[in-house]
């Protein structure tokens, strides 16, 4: 039950990261335009990963895209890939995650493979959450630096008799929601993977069964046991771990994998 | 069809207070800003202020202490009041709605306010 | 605040001759978001409210003819005329509309010969 549990959860919250992954990438407002220690302009400056916008304090507001590829900053394309391979690995994540959920049957798939298949997903959500908080760093780093640059511009570049508005960009909505986004995912990513570990199905222990060969005695003991010499030692089957099997010492009506819709 | 009116007292004496209402049709004072102009007798424009769609408000700064630009509750009317009025105060009062680059596309035909004792 | 200056003060000119006045604004009208240039040319006829001419600079308004013609970036700006009609004889002004206080140039008064 507390496998399930976990492994819903997990789904449930690396859905929700990986949709504010997707939103953080269509928002445009990775970087917004400064308003502190600024004039106050009747025109509000933000971009994001695909197009700029201006709005107007009379409510107009104009988005161009960039219709360049070659003409932009490596470290925008390096963000925009980041961004959509995590979205990328997140979608096929959620795909396999959906299938590996331990309340939906598909045919006779085995525990095993429902494990595999958790696994997996979880590793593509931590990857995908990884890929959306390293993008989002990257432009928050980039931002800081331009910042700083043009800080630096603001009191050294007054020389002339013309004064030029100075446009300083800080972090906008999108940042703080790729963060949050990248986070969960990553969480929702350690739960399936958590999940996984109580999905494995433990290995099948049987009745010991002693072969007795002449000079000296061996008993083998199949079922992942350690064969032990003599017969004193382990005579008695032993479970490697408590994960919900029984011996046969403990036979008692015990729910089979098919009874669960 | 947009169509802004101003109305005013039309005399006012010195040190007392104004306020002029604009009243619109045609558009929603919750999608476009408005803003107030004055020009006095045979001289240039001044800008004075604007309320925006959303409410806030910008002003000319030398007369920020005396103005105050606000709109009704059933978004029709925008009112300017100003404060210790003085000579030089007598004007031409002018609303005009905001469009694109902020500019003042369609203006009232004014209302004049003569400040003397 | 920003001072726009706009020269000449008044102009006097024959009908079907082309003109050209100017504006400058003590700071730069360019805004770096959008490469678009915050400056308005309206004109005053007698006895009239003004009327938008031209906004951003260059785009001229809805049911303006097109011998109006603004250009100019940053700092530096222009209305032309290119063949002056009796219609046309009011003051021109110009305003920033880019960094508050919006304000107004002195404006141009064109006269006809």
């Known amino acids: 039950m507390a496998v399930t549990a976990c492994q819903g959860l997990g789904f449930v919250v690396s859905l929700i990261g990986i949709a504010g992954i997707i939103a953080a990438t269509c928002m445009d407002q990775w970087s917004t335009q400064d308003l502190y220690n600024n004039p106050v302009t009747a025109v509000f400056n933000y971009q994001g990963l695909w197009r700029s916008c201006v709005r107007e304090s009379s409510g107009f507001t104009e988005c161009r895209g960039y219709f360049t590829l070659l003409g932009l900053p490596a470290m925008l394309q390096a963000v925009r890939a980041l961004m959509i391979v995590g979205i990328v690995l997140g979608a096929i994540g959620l795909l396999v995650s959906i299938f590996a959920l331990k309340c939906i049957r598909i045919g006779s798939m085995e525990d095993s493979a429902k494990a595999n298949m958790t696994l997996t997903s979880g590793i593509m959500f931590i990857v995908s959450g990884l890929c959306a908080i390293a993008g989002v760093s990257v432009f928050a780093n980039m931002l800081v630096t331009n910042f700083w640059m043009s800080t630096a511009n603001m009191y050294t570049g007054m020389g002339g008799m013309v004064q030029t508005v100075q446009t300083r960009y800080t972090f906008g909505a999108a940042l703080f929601v790729g963060w949050v986004a990248g986070g969960l995912t990553l969480i929702g990513g350690v739960m399936m993977c958590i999940a996984c570990r109580g999905l494995a199905p433990e290995e099948t222990n049987y009745k010991a069964v002693s072969y007795h060969a002449s000079g000296h005695s061996v008993a083998y003991k199949p079922g992942g046991f350690k064969a032990s010499t003599g017969f004193g030692s382990n005579t008695k089957n032993k479970k490697i771990y408590d994960g919900g099997a029984r011996t046969e010492d403990e036979v008692q009506s015990y729910p089979s994998k098919h009874d669960y819709v | 069809q947009v169509q802004l009116k101003e109305s005013g007292p039309g005399q006012v004496a010195p040190s007392q207070s104004l306020s002029i209402a604009c009243t619109v049709s045609?558009?929603?004072?919750?999608?476009?800003?408005v803003h107030w102009v004055r020009q006095p007798p045979g001289k240039g424009l001044e800008w004075l202020g604007v309320?925006?769609?959303?409410?806030?408000?910008n002003y000319d700064s030398a007369l920020m202490s005396r103005l105050t630009i606000s709109k009704d509750n059933s978004r029709t009317r925008v009112f300017l009041k100003m404060n210790s009025l003085q000579t030089d105060d007598t004007a031409i009062y002018y609303c005009?709605?905001?469009?694109?680059?902020?500019?003042?596309?369609?203006w009232g035909p004014g209302t004049t306010l003569t400040v003397s004792s | 605040d920003i001072v726009m200056t706009q020269s000449p003060s008044s102009l006097t000119v024959t009908a079907g001759e082309k003109v050209t006045m100017s504006c400058k604004s003590s700071q730069s009208l360019l805004n770096s978001g959008n490469q678009r240039n915050y400056l308005t040319w309206y004109q005053q006829k007698p006895g009239q409210p003004p009327r938008l001419l031209i906004y951003?600079?260059?785009t001229r308004d809805s049911g303006v003819p097109d011998r109006f013609t603004g250009s100019g970036s940053r700092t530096d700006f222009t209305l032309t005329i290119s063949s002056v009609q009796a219609e046309d004889l009011a003051v021109y002004y110009c305003q920033n509309n880019f960094i508050y206080p919006l304000t107004f140039g002195a404006g141009t008064k064109l006269e006809l010969k």
């Open positions: 951003w600079s260059s």
């Open positions: 309320i925006w769609a959303g409410g806030s408000t």
């Open positions: 005009a709605r905001s469009l694109y680059g902020n500019s003042l596309d369609s």
């Open positions: 045609g558009f929603s004072l919750s999608s476009y800003g």
